[in-house]
C-alpha cells in the first residue's frame, strides 16, 4: 500500500495473509515489475525541483536567474529556452542567467530578442551555435558563493537545482513568489517560472492481475502531491500503437484533489480519474471524476474492479504539467524487464528484512527494551528461534503475545557514546542459516544539549541576540553532540514579547505561520533553519523577548517510539528602529504615530475652532446641545488613537495601520 511507515507495510502483509472475503485491501495479486521501454515509456514536464526558490524583485533593473545543473554522466545535451512576454509593448528588463554545471554539456540556447547576459564556465559549457548574447566567465565557486556572486549583480528572481535535465523552459517576468529574496529551499514548486523535463523517463511498471479473464489493459498514472496546492491542470497525452478496434483499455489518473486533467488520447478508452477531466477536442466540457485510492495497492484494486487483466503501465510522478505515455501493448502479453528485484515476498516465506523492521525499541529508566509482537511474526510466516542483543547471553523473554528483550545501558555489550547508546538486535530464524542483525539506538539525553542561534544574515555566520523590527532575522536550532541516526526537526516556535507585546506564533505544526516566516533548507549538518520579519504597529515596542522553540529528535529509520521532544529558549533584545522620521524603508513607526496624532490634534482643534465660530454667530435662542464630536477625517488617526499604550506585533502582516 506504499504507506511509508513500517506498521503500514506490515498492514499490507497482514492483509495478504488474512484473505477474508471482506478485506477492502483484498490484496490484489499483481507483482509490479519494470516494463521495457519498447513496451511503454513515460516522459513528463514538471515545475517541481529538488531545491529552488522564486522571489519578486519588481523594481530591479536586472532580472537574475540561477540554474545549478547536475548531470550524472557527461557530456550531456541540454535544450534551454528563455521566454519573455512583452510588457507594455516593450521587451522586459535585462536578464542575467547564471549557469552552474558539474560536467560537460552541449547547450542549445533559445532566447530570441531577450537582452541576455550569460554567466557560465566556458570549459564545461559548449554552445551548439554561437549564443549571440553577452557572456561572462563564472568563477569556480561552491553553490552558496555562486548565489552571493549573482546577488551582488542584482536581486535573484529565481534559483533552481535540477538533476539531469533534458530541456528547460524559463519564463521571464513571471515570478509569482511571495518572498522578497531568493534562498534555495528543498522540494520547491517553481510555478510558471520554470518547467523542465528530466532526461530519464519515469519508471514504468506493469503486472498481470491474477484471476481476471479477458484482455482489458489498464494504464495507471499517479501524480504525487506537489509543494504548492493551487489548482493545476495536467495534460496527459496517451499514444497507444495498435489498431483502434484492437484495444480494450482503461486509463486511471489519480492525483491530489486540486489537480484536473486534460486528456489527449489517440484511442477510445475508459477514463477513470480523480478531480475533473476534459478532452483536448472538447476542452471546455469538464467531467466529474471520482475519489480514487491514493495508494498503489488501492489503484491496482480499482483496475481489477474495472475488469482489467493487465496493468500495462503503472507510473508514479511528481506533480507535472505535461505527461506523455507511449505504449504498445494492445492487450497482448505483458513483457517485463529481465529479473527485476522482487518487491513482494512470495507467499509462505519469511521476509527477514520486514521481520527486523518490526522490532520496536523503547528507551526509558537507563535501559533499552526491544519488543517483537508474535502476531506480526506469525503473519510473516517466520519462526524465531532466538532474539538477543550483541551479547548472546542477553536473551529475550517470551511474554505470551510478544518477545521482550531488556537491558540496562551498562550491560549486554551496550556501546555508550556522547550522544547515544547503541547495540545490535540479533534474530535467529528457522529458515535462515545466518542470524539477522539490526542496529538499535537510544539517545543519551543527559549529554545532549539543544541551542537556538539567531543570525542577522542568511549565511548563518555571525550569531546575535538582537532583533530589529523590519529587519529579517535568521534562526538555527542545533543539537550537540550531533546524532547522525536521528533527524532534528522544528515542531513549533513562538516569540513571547511580555505583557505588552503578547505572543507571536512563528511556526506551528512544522509549518510557517504568517507571510513573513520562511522555513529554510537545513544546514549541511541537518540543523533546522527559518527566518522571520517582525513589525510593530503600535507603541511602546518591547525591549526584550523570549524566542521559544519545540524541537523533536526523530529516528531516521524505524520506530517512532523513540521520538524526543525538547523546548529551547533564547532571550532576545529588541532594538527600536531609528527615530529620525524617514528611512529607506519608509516612515518608521514613531514618526507615523507622530504625524497621525498630529493630524488628529489639528483635526480636533479645527473642529473646536469652527464650532466656536459657528456657535457664537447664531442667535442664542437657536443653540442646540453638542451631540458628538466629529470624528477625525483620517481613519488611521482614529484607529491608532484606540491602540495607544498597547503593542500589536505580527510576523510581517501586510496590513499596516499607518
Amino acid at each position: 500500500m506504499d504507506r511509508g511507515t513500517l506498521p503500514l507495510a506490515v498492514a499490507l502483509l497482514l492483509a495478504s495473509c488474512s484473505l477474508s472475503p471482506t478485506s477492502l485491501a483484498e490484496t490484489v495479486h499483481c507483482d509490479l515489475q519494470p516494463v521495457g521501454p519498447e513496451r511503454g515509456e513515460v516522459t513528463y514536464t514538471t515545475s517541481q525541483v529538488s531545491k529552488g526558490c522564486v522571489a519578486q524583485a519588481p523594481n530591479a533593473i536586472l532580472e537574475v536567474h540561477v540554474l545549478f545543473l547536475e548531470f550524472p554522466t557527461g557530456p550531456s545535451q541540454l535544450e534551454l529556452t528563455l521566454q519573455a512576454s512583452k510588457q507594455n509593448g516593450t521587451w522586459p528588463r535585462e536578464v542575467l542567467l547564471v549557469l552552474s554545471v558539474n560536467s560537460s554539456v552541449f547547450l542549445h540556447l533559445q532566447a530570441l530578442g531577450i537582452p541576455l547576459h550569460l554567466a557560465y564556465n566556458s570549459s564545461l559549457v559548449t554552445f551548439q551555435e554561437p549564443p549571440g548574447v553577452n557572456t561572462t566567465e563564472l568563477p569556480s565557486f561552491p553553490k552558496t558563493q555562486i548565489l552571493e556572486w549573482a546577488a551582488e549583480r542584482g536581486p535573484i528572481t529565481s534559483a533552481a537545482e535540477l538533476n539531469d535535465p533534458q530541456s528547460i523552459l524559463l519564463r521571464l517576468g513571471q515570478a509569482q513568489g511571495s518572498l522578497s529574496f531568493c534562498m534555495l529551499e528543498a522540494s520547491q514548486d517553481m510555478g510558471r517560472t520554470l518547467e523542465w523535463r528530466p532526461r530519464t523517463p519515469a519508471l514504468v511498471r506493469g503486472c498481470h492481475l491474477e484471476g481476471v479473464a479477458g484482455h482489458k489493459e489498464a494504464h495507471i498514472l499517479r501524480v504525487l502531491p506537489g509543494h504548492s496546492a493551487g489548482p493545476r491542470t495536467v495534460t496527459v497525452k496517451v499514444e497507444l500503437s495498435c489498431a483502434p478496434g484492437d484495444l480494450d483499455a482503461v486509463l486511471i489518473l489519480q492525483g491530489p484533489p486540486y489537480v484536473s486533467w486534460l486528456i489527449d488520447a489517440n484511442h477510445n478508452m475508459q477514463i477513470w480519474t480523480t478531480g475533473e477531466y476534459s478532452f483536448k477536442i472538447f476542452p471546455e466540457k469538464n467531467i466529474r471524476g471520482f475519489k480514487l485510492p491514493d495508494t498503489p495497492q488501492g489503484l491496482l484494486g480499482e483496475a481489477r474492479m474495472l475488469n482489467a487483466s493487465i496493468v500495462a503501465s503503472f507510473v508514479e510522478l511528481p506533480l507535472a504539467s505535461i505527461v506523455s505515455l507511449h505504449a504498445s501493448s494492445c492487450g497482448g502479453r505483458l513483457q517485463t524487464s529481465p529479473a527485476p528485484i522482487q518487491t513482494t515476498p512470495p507467499k509462505d516465506t519469511c521476509s527477514p528484512e520486514l521481520l527486523m523492521s518490526l522490532i520496536q525499541t523503547k528507551c526509558a529508566d537507563d535501559a533499552m527494551t526491544l519488543v517483537l509482537k508474535k502476531e506480526l511474526v506469525a503473519h510473516l510466516k517466520c519462526t524465531i528461534t532466538g532474539l538477543t542483543f550483541w551479547d548472546p547471553s542477553c536473551e529475550a523473554e517470551d511474554r505470551g503475545d510478544k518477545f521482550v528483550l531488556r537491558s540496562a545501558y551498562s550491560s549486554c555489550g551496550m556501546q555508550v557514546s556522547a550522544s547515544m547508546i547503541s547495540n545490535e538486535a540479533v534474530v535467529n530464524i528457522l529458515s535462515s542459516s545466518s542470524p539477522q542483525r539490526k542496529k538499535v539506538h537510544c539517545l543519551n539525553m543527559d549529554s545532549l544539549s539543544f541551542q537556538l542561534g539567531l543570525y542577522l544574515s542568511p549565511h548563518f555566520l555571525q550569531a546575535s541576540n538582537t532583533i530589529e523590527p523590519g529587519q529579517q532575522s535568521f534562526v538555527q536550532v542545533r543539537v550537540s553532540p550531533s546524532v547522525s541516526e536521528f533527524l532534528l526537526q522544528l515542531d513549533s516556535c513562538h516569540l513571547d514579547l511580555g505583557p505588552e507585546g503578547g505572543t507571536v506564533e512563528l511556526i506551528q505544526g512544522r509549518a510557517a505561520k504568517g507571510n513573513c516566516v520562511s522555513l529554510l533548507s537545513p544546514s549541511p549538518e541537518g540543523d533546522p533553519r527559518f527566518s522571520f520579519l517582525l513589525h510593530f504597529y503600535t507603541v511602546p515596542i518591547p525591549k526584550t523577548g523570549t524566542l521559544s522553540c519545540t524541537v523533536a529528535l526523530r529516528p531516521k529509520t524505524g520506530s517512532q517510539d523513540q521520538e524526543v521532544h525538547r523546548t529551547v529558549f533564547m532571550r532576545l533584545n529588541i532594538i527600536s528602529p531609528d527615530l529620525s522620521g524617514c528611512t529607506s524603508k519608509g516612515l518608521v513607526l514613531p514618526a507615523v504615530l507622530g504625524i497621525t496624532f498630529g493630524a488628529f490634534l489639528i483635526g480636533a482643534l479645527l473642529t473646536a475652532a469652527l464650532w466656536y465660530i459657528y456657535s457664537h454667530t447664531r442667535s442664542p435662542s437657536k443653540r442646540e446641545p453638542v451631540v458628538a464630536v466629529a470624528a477625525p477625517a483620517s481613519s488611521e488617526s482614529s484607529s491608532t488613537n484606540h491602540s495607544i499604550g498597547s503593542t500589536q506585533s505580527t510576523p510581517c502582516s501586510t496590513s499596516s495601520m499607518a
Epitope: 498492514a11 477492502l24 475519489k291 488501492g298
Partner: antibody, heavy 120, light 107 residues
Framework: QEQLVESGGGVVQPGRSLRLSCTAS????????IHWVRQAPGKGLEWVTV????????YYADSVKGRFTISRDNSKNTLYLQMNSLRAEDTAVYYC?????????????WGQGTLVTVSS | DIQMTQSPSSLSASVGDRVTITCQAS??????LNWYQQRPGKAPNLLIY???NLETGVPSRFSGSGSGTDFTFTISSLQPEDFARYFC?????????FGGGTRVEIK
C-alpha cells in the same frame, strides 16, 4: 444534482420480509459501488452491506449475513435490499449511500433514508 | 472489525469557538477516514475524505488531519449552522465502521 431516494420502508412484524429500493439520478449509477447504512433511533451509524459497481461483489455485516440480500439493476438506476427474517433490532432508518468509486471505499452521497420499524 | 473511538461524545461551544474532535482507530488505517456532519432528522453529509481532503463545496473552516490510528477534525470558527452531530468513519477494511459521534451543542 446527485440524488439517491430510498423507498419501501414501513412497519413489519418480526420474522417477516421487506424490500427496500433506492433510485439514483444525476450521476452515472453504473460507475459506483453503493452501500446500505442504517441508524437505529437516537443511535450511531451502522454499515449493513455494499455492492460493487457491476454487481459482481457483495459484502454484508455479520449481523445481517444470511438474512439480507443486496442487488442492483443498472438499467433502471436502482438498488435493492431484500430483508428477510426481520428482528426488532433491525428497526432503523436505512440509508443508501454512494461509494467513492467502483471500489467499496468511503461514502460521499447519502439518500434521505427510509424508516423500517420491526414490531409485533 | 476495526473499532473507531471518537471523543468527546458531546461538547458545548459558542459561535466563533475553535472545536476539535478526535477519532482513534483500533489498528492502522493509513488515511482511509471520512468525517461527516449529521443534522437532526437528516442524512449524514461528507465534509472530509482521505483524512484531510475537503469535500467540494464544504467551507474551509472545516479541516482534518492524521494518519495511521489517530485523527483530528477541527472547526476553526464555529458558525450557527455547525451545531450538529459529527461522525468519523474508516473505510480501510470491511465492515465500514463509524465512531460513536460527537454532538456539538450551543453553550
Amino acid at each position: 444534482q446527485e440524488q439517491l431516494v430510498e423507498s419501501g420502508g414501513g412497519v413489519v412484524q418480526p420474522g417477516r420480509s421487506l424490500r427496500l429500493s433506492c433510485t439514483a439520478s444525476g450521476f452515472t449509477f453504473s460507475n459506483y459501488g453503493i452501500h446500505w447504512v442504517r441508524q437505529a433511533p437516537g443511535k450511531g451509524l451502522e454499515w449493513v452491506t455494499v455492492i460493487s459497481y457491476d454487481g459482481s461483489k457483495k459484502y454484508y455485516a455479520d449481523s445481517v449475513k444470511g438474512r439480507f440480500t443486496i442487488s442492483r439493476d443498472n438499467s433502471k438506476n436502482t438498488l435493492y435490499l431484500q430483508m428477510n427474517s426481520l428482528r426488532a433490532e433491525d428497526t432503523a432508518v436505512y440509508y443508501c449511500a454512494r461509494a467513492f468509486s467502483t471500489m467499496v471505499r468511503g461514502v460521499d452521497h447519502w439518500g434521505q433514508g427510509t424508516l423500517v420499524t420491526v414490531s409485533s | 472489525d476495526i473499532q473507531m473511538t471518537q471523543s468527546p461524545s458531546s461538547l458545548s461551544a459558542s459561535v466563533g469557538d475553535r472545536v476539535t474532535i478526535t477519532c482513534q482507530a483500533s489498528q492502522d488505517i493509513y488515511k482511509s477516514l471520512n468525517w461527516y456532519q449529521q443534522r437532526p432528522g437528516k442524512a449524514p453529509n461528507l465534509l472530509i475524505y482521505d483524512a484531510s481532503n475537503l469535500e467540494t463545496g464544504v467551507p474551509s473552516r472545516f479541516s482534518g488531519s492524521g494518519s495511521g490510528t489517530d485523527f483530528t477534525f477541527t472547526i476553526s470558527s464555529l458558525q450557527p449552522e455547525d451545531f450538529a452531530r459529527y461522525f468519523c468513519q474508516q473505510y480501510d477494511n470491511l465492515p465500514l465502521t463509524f465512531g460513536g459521534g460527537t454532538r456539538v451543542e450551543i453553550k
